[in-house]
């Protein structure tokens, strides 16, 4: 089994308020087994944006079809962006367990929000 890498290709993404933001994340291996989660921010104050094993997350949809058994694309789209959504988003692989434990994080994608065009 190859070592898991988490690829967040975009260092930054800029989106106009009211639009949708696509945050890209691909993994290179299904192992270790466990869910993908997205967070805004780091450390104890980070905010859960999406968790593969639970939901729903009304403003968040996955870009690819995560029900495919071999899926390794966990990019997400966040709708109706507001200035409060600005921040750095991390795609994180968890290892299954009770509870699941954080295994590896992507480098992060900084989302900036532009004013809505008049």
């Amino acid at each position: 089994e190859e070592e898991l890498q988490i690829i967040q290709p975009d260092k930054s993404v800029s989106v106009a308020a009211g639009e949708s933001a696509i945050l890209h994340c691909t993994i290179t291996s299904l192992f270790p087994v466990g869910p993908i989660q997205w967070f805004r921010g780091a450390g104890p104050a980070r905010v859960l944006i999406y968790n593969q094993r639970q939901g729903p997350f009304p403003r968040v949809t996955t870009v690819s079809e995560t029900t495919k058994r071999e899926n390794m694309d966990f990019s997400i789209s966040i709708s109706n962006i507001t200035p409060a959504d600005a921040g750095t988003y991390y795609c994180i692989k968890f290892r299954k367990g009770s509870p699941d434990t954080e295994f590896k994080s992507g480098a992060g994608t900084e989302l900036s929000v532009r004013a809505k065009p008049s």
């Epitope: 094993r53 079809e65 029900t67 495919k68 058994r69 009770s98």
Partner: antibody, heavy 118, light 106 residues
Framework: DVQLVESGGAVVRPGETLRLSCTAS????????MSWVRQAPGKGLEWVSG????????YYADSVKGRSTISRDNSKNTLYLRMSSLTAEDTAVYYC???????????WGLGTLVTLSS | ALTQPASVSANPGETVKITCSGG?????YGWYQQKSPGSAPVTLI????KRPSDIPSRFSGSASGSTATLTITGVQAEDEAVYYC???????????FGAGTTLTVL
């Protein structure tokens, strides 16, 4: 409430073809992967086939590979299993089941009986 | 293949543990109850330890390494059934089941 109702079971002769259906209600069918699981008389459960939410990707047990086709019509909330070249070993109750995020099962239908008789 | 005991028995009120092994660390496990042959299975546990909201709290699941365990705390007469463990293997994209464990409540 989630409901899965199978139909199409019948008494058939060896070598014939049969199509089973499973009609779903109570959830957003197009968002979930689905599977068929069977149980031969006096035996345990055997996974037969699975399909991704859009229907683009399909998966089969070795015991049916090459002579079975799983498909779905999301506009009709219906899952199908077409089985050809049937043999006595295919005699079983066939259940459709909804998959969880990690391809286990959370809801099951009541089953439909397929009997091979020469 | 997943391995589980063929049968277990217990008195009402006792705690029963049914084990399932052989899935490896690349598997998730689920537990399914079937009260009579040919009747619809009911999911008790999925994702190793997740219990659907309509399942009584006396049923719990756990997994360590390549072994999963279903625990029934305070077994009741109505729990008499066959219990199947099931697994999904990320290396093969295939679901497998154990042969089933018959629980007899004495």
């Amino acid at each position: 409430d989630v409901q899965l109702v199978e139909s199409g079971g019948a008494v058939v002769r060896p070598g014939e073809t049969l199509r089973l259906s499973c009609t779903a209600s109570g959830f957003t069918f197009s968002s979930y992967a689905m599977s068929w699981v069977r149980q031969a008389p006096g035996k345990g459960l055997e996974w037969v086939s699975g399909i991704s939410a859009s229907g683009s990707d399909t998966y089969y047990a070795d015991s049916v590979k090459g002579r079975s086709t799983i498909s779905r019509d999301n506009s009709k909330n219906t899952l199908y299993l077409r089985m050809s070249s049937l043999t006595a070993e295919d005699t079983a109750v066939y259940y459709c089941a909804r998959e969880t995020w990690n391809h286990l099962f959370d809801y099951w239908g009541l089953g439909t009986l397929v009997t091979l008789s020469s | 293949a997943l391995t589980q005991p063929a049968s277990v028995s217990a008195n009402p009120g006792e705690t029963v543990k049914i084990t399932c092994s052989g899935g490896g660390t690349s598997s998730y496990y689920g537990w399914y109850q079937q009260k009579s042959p040919g009747s619809a299975p009911v999911t008790l546990i999925h994702s190793d330890d997740k219990r659907p909201s309509d399942i009584p709290s006396r049923f719990s699941g756990s997994a360590s390494g390549s072994t999963a365990t279903l625990t029934i705390t305070g077994v009741q007469a109505e729990d008499e059934a066959v219990y199947y463990c099931g697994g999904y293997d990320y290396t093969t994209y295939v679901n497998t089941f154990g042969a089933g464990t018959t629980l007899t409540v004495l």
